[in-house]
């Protein structure tokens, strides 16, 4: 059987053979991959990139959250959606997950001007069916998925909006475990609305196998701030393996070449 995909840190600290990022299959060796370094001064302003409209993001829910062996994932089950933001159609929220390290300088997947952040949060959405503008696009959409990417840095205050998620981590240390979070809304996890006006946009891929090149990326300029202990909880409470020998951290795909693509900004 073919080895399962993994991150470099798992291969270094585990006896199980697995495929590290440079050996990922599927579409992962193509040329329109994510994440990338965003050179902020090279990104051209596009007036079409307006504000986002969030539907259902403010509704308090008891979300299911799981350790999937690669990250921690909240199941959003179409209970929220987004539109605007220069997107071609409304998109339904499917899941939310994060990437992190155990040090402040290398936990994000995307980087801004070469700088990585402590964490990165991805809210993954799928385009509502029947909204593609032409047949070609419907068959081979490069924007079937819209990911909102939020960089995370340390601040001096506890971010109360993240506490339901952080507190749930203790219940899902091992892969395939799931739990129900205390009631919260997606809006609780986001920066204030005025901080969502500035973002970068490019076309890329999923950052995990099979790395499908069908993602319209939105990387927000303003980071979310979490307290030091909230950030550390992810690498302290979660494990890649059922034996709880390999702490879940450095679940970060290396940067990919921008190539012929362009990055635009709001």
């Amino acid at each position: 059987a073919e080895s399962h995909w993994c991150y470099e840190v798992q291969a270094e600290s585990s006896n199980y053979p697995c495929l590290v990022p440079v050996k990922w299959g599927g579409n992962c060796q193509k040329d329109r991959q994510s994440p990338i370094n965003i050179v902020t001064t090279k990104a051209k302003v596009d007036k079409k990139l307006g504000r986002f409209f969030f539907s259902g993001y403010d509704k308090k829910q008891t979300w299911t959250v799981q350790n999937n062996g690669h990250s921690v994932m909240m199941l959003l089950e179409n209970k929220a959606s987004i539109s605007g933001g220069g997107l071609p159609a409304p998109y339904q929220a499917k899941q939310l997950h994060l990437h992190w390290s155990d040090l402040p300088y290398k936990g994000s997947e995307h980087s801004l001007d070469g700088e990585h952040f402590a964490m990165e949060m991805h809210i993954v959405h799928e385009k509502e069916k029947g909204t593609s503008r032409n047949v070609k696009e419907a068959q081979d959409p490069e924007d079937e998925i819209a990911v909102l990417a939020f960089l995370v840095e340390a601040g001096t205050q506890v971010n109360e909006g993240f506490q339901p998620l952080v507190e749930a981590l203790s219940n899902i240390p091992k892969p395939e475990m799931s739990t129900t979070m205390a009631e919260s809304s997606l809006l609780d996890l986001l920066p204030k609305e005025e901080k969502l006006r500035h973002y970068f946009r490019y076309l890329g891929s999923l950052t995990t196998p099979t790395c499908d090149e069908k993602v319209v990326w939105t990387v927000f300029r303003e980071p979310i701030q979490l307290h030091r202990e909230q950030i550390l909880a992810f690498s302290q409470k979660l494990y890649y393996d059922k034996e709880q020998t390999v702490s879940m951290k450095d679940n970060v795909r290396p940067l990919q070449q921008l190539g012929q693509r362009t990055v635009i900004k709001s």
Epitope: D102, L103, A154, R228, I231, S235
Partner: antibody
Framework: DVQLVESGAELVRPGTSMKMSCKAS????????IEWIKQRPGQGLEWIGV????????HYNEKFKDKATLTADKSSSTAYMQLSSLTSDDSAVYFC????????????WGQGTTLTVSS | QIQITQSPAILSVSPGERVSFSCRAS??????IHWYQQRTNGSPRLLIK???ESISGIPSRFSGSGSGTDFTLSINSVESEDIAVYYC?????????FGAGTKLELK
């Protein structure tokens, strides 16, 4: 009270290695990063690297990545820095410090370990 | 990496005078600057965090201001125990960097 106590002054020969320690007390050792800083006589402060004592994860200033190795022992709440292939340029005071916010300021410092490299 | 320039290198003051130290970053760093005092043969001591936020246990005569690229540490009435070297540190970008320091001495 938070305290960081560093090991005593060392006089060592060029080409050798040495390991200094930084014992922490008064707080949860695994919940804060430990940073190491170099200060040459009469000079400013230069950041060497950082360790997460909880995980053992390290990150180095490019300039020191072949010079310094950072480790930590959770059971004794002690961080260590080993310096290798010592030359007179390594003669300095070395400080450990606790990092307050996860990538920001250093709120508590050790008293410093003076290293003299001389034949 | 971000360069930090402190000026002047030496400041001479009389007790009771107000004194200001300058720190300039090579690019905008918001308010991510922290100030330290280092007395002769001592360890650095944190005085001000995030450009202007006070630190518990530090005398109120120490204050900080600025954002972007230009920052100031002020002592509103210098005392003899303030004789030391003062450093600023940026934590906006990795690797963190320090200024070369300003030495405060008595006239």
């Amino acid at each position: 009270d938070v305290q960081l106590v560093e090991s005593g002054a060392e006089l060592v020969r060029p080409g050798t290695s040495m390991k200094m320690s930084c014992k922490a007390s008064g707080y949860a050792f695994t919940n804060y990063l430990i940073e190491w800083i170099k200060q040459r006589p009469g000079q400013g402060l230069e950041w060497i690297g950082v360790i997460n004592p909880g995980s053992g994860g390290t990150h180095y200033n490019e300039k020191f990545k072949d010079k310094a190795t950072l480790t930590a022992d959770k059971s004794s709440s002690t961080a260590y820095m080993q310096l290798s292939s010592l030359t007179s340029d390594d003669s300095a005071v070395y400080f450990c410090a606790r990092e307050a916010d996860y990538g920001s300021r250093f709120d508590y410092w050790g008293q410093g370990t003076t290293l003299t490299v001389s034949s | 990496q971000i360069q930090i320039t402190q000026s002047p290198a030496i400041l001479s003051v009389s007790p009771g005078e107000r004194v200001s130290f300058s720190c300039r970053a090579s690019q905008s760093i918001g308010t991510r600057i922290h100030w330290y005092q280092q007395r002769t043969n001592g360890s650095p001591r944190l005085l001000i965090k995030y450009a202007s936020e006070s630190i518990s246990g530090i005398p109120s005569r120490f204050s900080g201001s600025g954002s972007g690229t230009d920052f100031t540490l002020s002592i509103n009435s210098v005392e003899s125990e303030d004789i030391a070297v003062y450093y600023c540190q940026q934590s906006n970008s990795w690797p963190t960097t320090f200024g070369a320091g300003t030495k405060l001495e008595l006239k």
